[in-house]
């Protein structure tokens, strides 16, 4: 799913207030809901009919530093006999997510949001024929 | 996938620099990679063997304001005959993502990162028997 562009009003103060300095805002360092947990079934990446592998990318100047990307293992889907059925397609499910980028020039540290496209897993779909007009 | 807790050093300046005021940092207002696009196959939510619906939640004090959640349509998966096969399970694929929360008290505006658990879609898995020890 696509994250829309940030509205120019999002970072502004209410109209009745004095304007903020252009270009930066105050970011509180705590993270809301930091302890909430993913409640996903176990090992779905290997038990799925459209299985996938994970690759981890690491960047110490990004939060989260670790971003995990899924890659579908097959073009087709795995049938009840454990064989690849190419009448179906394994396709990635993608999600735009935000990360926090740390930038420093000497002793000046600032942060900026960054959009990252994450492939979260794969699903098995019926392909459709494209009829040329 | 789970986002780890933010390390206490992430918001700190290099050791040789004077310390920052506790609790807040400078957030640049632009967003890096704002124009990148999701390149997902069309209508996969309806073509999947584990189809799903979308629900949109809206919050003007959050960026992105719109967060889309998927819900699997069936307990089982759709077979080649279009029937629900309950020997398989439709299960949600979840992803922890970050959003930016806007907080204002009068004319004071600050921002804070918030973790949100998003169900991105569904995949079809083979259930396994839990063997009692």
């Amino acid at each position: 799913r696509k994250i829309p562009k940030v509205g120019h009003t999002f970072f502004q103060k209410p109209e009745s207030c004095p304007p903020v300095p252009e270009g930066s805002m105050k970011l509180d360092t705590g993270i809301i809901n930091e302890n909430q947990r993913v409640s996903m079934s176990r090992n779905i990446e290997s038990r799925s009919t459209s299985p996938w592998n994970y690759t981890v990318t690491w960047d110490p100047n990004r939060y989260p530093s670790e971003v995990v990307q899924a890659q579908c293992k097959h073009l087709g889907c795995i049938n009840a006999q454990g064989k690849e059925d190419i009448s179906m397609n394994s396709v990635p499910i993608q999600q735009e997510t935000l990360v926090l980028r740390r930038k420093h020039q000497g002793c000046s540290v600032s942060f900026q949001l960054e959009k990252v496209l994450v492939t979260v897993g794969c699903t098995c779909v019926t392909p459709v024929v494209h009829h040329v007009q | 996938r789970k986002i780890p807790k933010v390390g206490h050093t992430f918001f700190q300046k290099p050791e040789s620099c004077p310390p920052v005021p506790e609790g807040s940092m400078k957030l640049d207002t632009g967003i890096i990679n704002e124009n990148q696009r999701v390149s997902m196959s069309r209508n996969i939510e309806s073509r999947s063997t584990s189809p799903w619906n979308y629900t949109v939640t809206w919050d003007p004090n959050r960026y992105p304001s719109e967060v889309v959640q998927a819900q699997c349509k069936h307990l089982g998966c759709i077979n080649a005959q279009g029937k629900e096969d309950i020997s398989m399970n439709s299960v949600p694929i979840q992803q922890e993502t970050l959003v930016l929360r806007r907080k204002h008290q009068g004319c004071s505006v600050s921002f804070q990162l918030e973790k949100v658990l998003v169900t991105v879609g569904c995949t079809c898995v083979t259930p396994v028997v839990h063997h009692v020890q």
Partner: antibody, heavy 123, light 107 residues
Framework: EVQLVESGGGLVQPGRSLRLSCAAS????????MHWVRQAPGKGLEWVSG????????GYADSVKGRFTISRDNAKNSLYLQMNSLRAEDTALYYC????????????????WGQGTTVTVSS | EIVLTQSPATLSLSPGERATLSCRAS??????LAWYQQKPGQAPRLLIY???NRATGIPARFSGSGSGTDFTLTISSLEPEDFAVYYC?????????FGQGTKLEIK
């Protein structure tokens, strides 16, 4: 000892409501999907409803859809069945049963059953 | 929905004899068939799942076979405690369904 104990059954008039409960013990409740299965007097078994470990996936038999609601409270190791708009044909012994699947998913085969609670719908 | 038809409705045998119970599905259920035993006044007990796998704690005299539409539960040598009603159940297509039962009685 692995055990399921149902309660909440009774005699109720058509159109009224009843809430059944099932208390689980002896196993990690939130590791498993749970089901309600009923048996009309002198008849066979009929699957009624099922719920996965975190209540994210729920299913109902057509005969009860829109009238019955299954739910669970993992903190209390309890399963529930809210039965509204009851009909004479809902008269049965209602069993709570544990699914055999790992990871709280559905296998739809059930290896632990309670002794049942009787629901009688009659005017 | 898939209809499961069990036969015979009643089977009269003596202890020590071999019992063969049948379950036929209205369409293929692959191997996704289970067998349950129910004694009077008791809850059902899972015997066999996926056509031929014995559930935990089930004696070896119980065995299941078949795939597609025709399935068999065999009790190799009947014990007095085996006289009960037996149900088959499919988990192939929505909704899960049970057969009407076979009553195994002492001859």
């Amino acid at each position: 000892e692995v055990q399921l104990v149902e309660s909440g059954g009774g005699l109720v008039q058509p159109g009224r409501s009843l809430r059944l409960s099932c208390a689980a013990s002896g196993f990690t409740f939130d590791d498993f999907a749970m089901h309600w299965v009923r048996q009309a007097p002198g008849k066979g078994l009929e699957w009624v409803s099922g719920i996965n470990w975190n209540s994210g996936s729920i299913g109902y038999a057509d005969s009860v859809k829109g009238r019955f609601t299954i739910s669970r409270d993992n903190a209390k190791n309890s399963l529930y069945l809210q039965m509204n708009s009851l009909r004479a044909e809902d008269t049965a012994l209602y069993y709570c049963a544990k699914d055999i699947a790992a990871a709280g998913e559905f296998y739809f085969d059930m290896d632990v059953w309670g002794q049942g609670t009787t629901v009688t719908v009659s005017s | 929905e898939i209809v499961l038809t069990q036969s015979p409705a009643t089977l009269s045998l003596s202890p020590g004899e071999r019992a063969t119970l049948s379950c036929r599905a209205s369409q293929s259920v692959s191997s996704y068939l289970a067998w349950y035993q129910q004694k009077p006044g008791q809850a059902p007990r899972l015997l066999i799942y996926d056509a031929s796998n014995r559930a935990t704690g089930i004696p070896a005299r119980f065995s299941g076979s078949g795939s597609g539409t025709d399935f068999t539960l065999t009790i190799s040598s009947l014990e007095p405690e085996d006289f009960a009603v037996y149900y088959c159940q499919q988990r192939s297509n929505w909704p899960p369904t049970f057969g009407q039962g076979t009553k195994l009685e002492i001859k």
